[in-house]
Interface confidence: low
Amino acid sequence: APVRSLNCTLRDSQQKSLVMSGPYELKALHLQGQDMEQQVVFSMSFVQGEESNDKIPVALGLKEKNLYLSCVLKDDKPTLQLESVDPKNYPKKKMEKRFVFNKIEINNKLEFESAQFPNWYISTSQAENMPVFLGGTKGGQDITDFTMQFVSS
């Protein structure tokens, strides 16, 4: 069955962009001008999951890379990672739960809640050049709000 996808970039509410930091990590920092080309382009796929009017289940792959953001337990803590997948089989409508995020839109801002670990969100630090991570608090120091920009394929 087809899975609908669109290409986009994400910026946190402080306008920090997301870039690759090594092969399996993302970091958030302010970019300007030509440096904007460094930001990662996501292929956001609309997948199966528990749905409600305000929660849309999505998977976040890196465009033209066989890497997906996934949520796993590491040392008993929910952790965000970039996971390599077989490109012949992904994306698919029925993604494993660790790949699924509930995209929540509030006042034109987006949050991405882990479907595997409810109330844990894709987060960035206030500080520059720090890893993107899975955070268990909202409304504190860490940033959980993002905006989405469409990218032509």
Partner: antibody, heavy 120, light 107 residues
């Protein structure tokens, strides 16, 4: 409010081409799939294909590949469908409709339809 | 292609009557099903998507349900303005396919 306004009726000779437009207003054009559906006289509905203007993704019904070409112009918030090598069996009302790109893909709004008549 | 078999192809019903129209999918469509109403000479109007989600502004007398690969549209109490042709659509697999339609007329 959301509106999809299609171009007017067309009469074409067999072998000719026709380009139907669908001008969208009332929402962010790039964020919604535009669907194209046809209805031959007295018949049911048939899905032709779709385009997501935000990134140009297009999906066609295999039956209409080579017959229909779907495009979108984000500068004018207009989607187009061109039909080539017209035959009498292409006589139909052609509809555009939109679906919200990320919520269950439920068709929500429809254009008024464009009647294309193919006649020698 | 997935075949959507809609029944009945036409029916008469009385005002106030409960009416049910069904669509049977030839394979699993994962509840990706919409219902439309079309009146003569008019564009289709979306009533329901994802089996049972009512589009804004659609009267609550319309409802949708599923049992396996059988999908139903029910009008709890038929009104005069409900006459028209009803279509189902599966949008799980390309090409998306419509049912053949059910012509609903007032008795």
């Amino acid at each position: 409010q959301v509106q999809l306004v299609q171009s007017g009726a067309e009469v074409k000779k067999p072998g000719a081409s026709v380009k139907v437009s669908c001008k969208v207003s009332g929402y962010t054009f790039s964020r919604y799939w535009i669907e194209w559906v046809r209805q031959a006289p007295g018949k049911g509905l048939e899905w032709i294909g779709e385009i997501l203007p935000g990134n140009g993704n297009i999906n066609y019904n295999e039956k209409f590949k080579g017959k229909a070409t779907i495009t979108a112009d984000t500068s004018t918030d207009t989607a187009y469908m061109e039909l080539s090598s017209l035959r009498s069996e292409d006589t139909a009302v052609y509809y555009c409709s939109t679906i919200y790109y990320d919520y269950d893909q439920g068709f929500t709004y429809w254009g008024q339809g464009t009647l294309v008549t193919v006649s020698a | 292609d997935i075949k959507m078999t809609q029944s009945p192809s036409s029916m008469y019903a009385s005002l106030g009557e409960r009416v049910t129209i069904t669509c049977k999918a030839s394979q699993d469509i994962d509840r990706y099903l919409s219902w439309f109403q079309q009146k003569p000479g008019k564009s289709p109007k979306t009533l329901i998507y994802r089996v049972k989600r009512l589009v804004d502004g659609v009267p609550s007398r319309f409802s949708g349900s599923a049992s396996g690969q059988d999908y139903s549209l029910t009008i709890s109490s038929l009104q005069y303005e409900d006459m028209g042709i009803y279509y189902c659509l599966q949008y799980d697999e390309f090409p998306y396919t419509f049912g053949g339609g059910t012509k609903l007329e007032i008795k």
